[in-house]
């Protein structure tokens, strides 16, 4: 689900509104591109990215990509338009306020990606299953 509703285009710019119809400011995201990381085998990690950036376009959301191979671990933090694939994957969770990592199939490495739509939400990346809404027990709690 793509979070904001694009209402109209002015001068090739998208005017984006939130669920209440208020005009949405562009997102603030951590934006360090690719950096080496020490985040490994943890339920959640901080990005350790000191750069907070306004996204170029109002429809963009925050993205984090965690990759591990035989040589190193990296964490990528960027803004990205959820209508466009990133690393060949669709940003399925762009409406989420939290950056909940999901594993993607990439040969030769372990690859996790998350996206989210609250300010600086890609600063705290969450791997723990307890946050994953595909967990039926959590869904039960949510709908009770």
């Amino acid at each position: 689900t793509i979070p904001p509703h694009v209402q109209k285009s002015v001068n090739n710019d998208m005017i984006v509104t939130d669920n209440n119809g208020a005009v949405k400011f562009p997102q603030l995201c951590k934006f360090c591109d690719v950096r080496f990381s020490t985040c490994d085998n943890q339920k959640s990690c901080m990005s350790n990215c000191s750069i907070t950036s306004i996204c170029e376009k109002p429809q963009e959301v925050c993205v984090a990509v965690w990759r591990k191979n035989d040589e190193n671990i990296t964490l990528e933090t960027v803004c990205h338009d959820p209508k466009l694939p990133y690393h060949d994957f669709i940003l399925e969770d762009a409406a989420s306020p939290k950056c909940i990592m999901k594993e993607k199939k990439k040969p030769g490495e372990t690859f996790f990606m998350c996206s989210c739509s609250s300010d600086e939400c890609n600063d705290n990346i969450i791997f723990s299953e307890e946050y994953n809404t595909s967990n039926p027990d959590l869904l039960l709690v949510i709908f009770q």
């Epitope: 750069i51 950036s53 306004i54 996204c55 109002p58």
Partner: nanobody, 111 residues
Framework: QVQLQESGGGLVQAGGSLRLSCAAS????????VAWYRQPPGKQREGVAH???????IYADSVKGRFTISRDNSKNTVYLEMNSLKPEDTAVYYC??????WGQGTQVTVS
């Protein structure tokens, strides 16, 4: 080296006006989205006004009709015209542009 430098803040009475400037060096603001944010004392940073590179402007509901964001590309500067100021507009005002550029801020106090 990229620098954004705000100026124009100060002490003003309620109902008064100020014009903030954000002068850039090391970056061409005409090709960038630029926004003004503010941080009121003891509160979170909040978006005030946004100007896209395509010319579209966005304003926070709290300042709509009172504040105007504009650009002078020849001076590589963005402005925030603030009219009918209220005490709740008291804050440090920052300009920002992608990717991750922020000014040091300018204090606006409305008495």
């Amino acid at each position: 080296q990229v620098q954004l430098q705000e100026s124009g803040g100060g002490l003003v009475q309620a109902g008064g006006s100020l014009r903030l400037s954000c002068a850039a060096s090391g970056i061409d603001l005409s090709t960038k989205s630029v926004a003004w944010y503010r941080q009121p004392p003891g509160k979170q940073r909040e978006g005030v006004a946004h100007s896209s590179s395509g010319g579209t402007t966005i304003y926070a509901d709290s300042v709509k009709g009172r504040f105007t964001i504009s650009r002078d590309n020849s001076k590589n500067t963005v402005y925030l015209e603030m009219n009918s100021l209220k005490p709740e507009d008291t804050a440090v005002y920052y300009c920002t542009a992608p990717v991750g550029y922020w000014g040091q801020g300018t204090q606006v106090t409305v008495s």
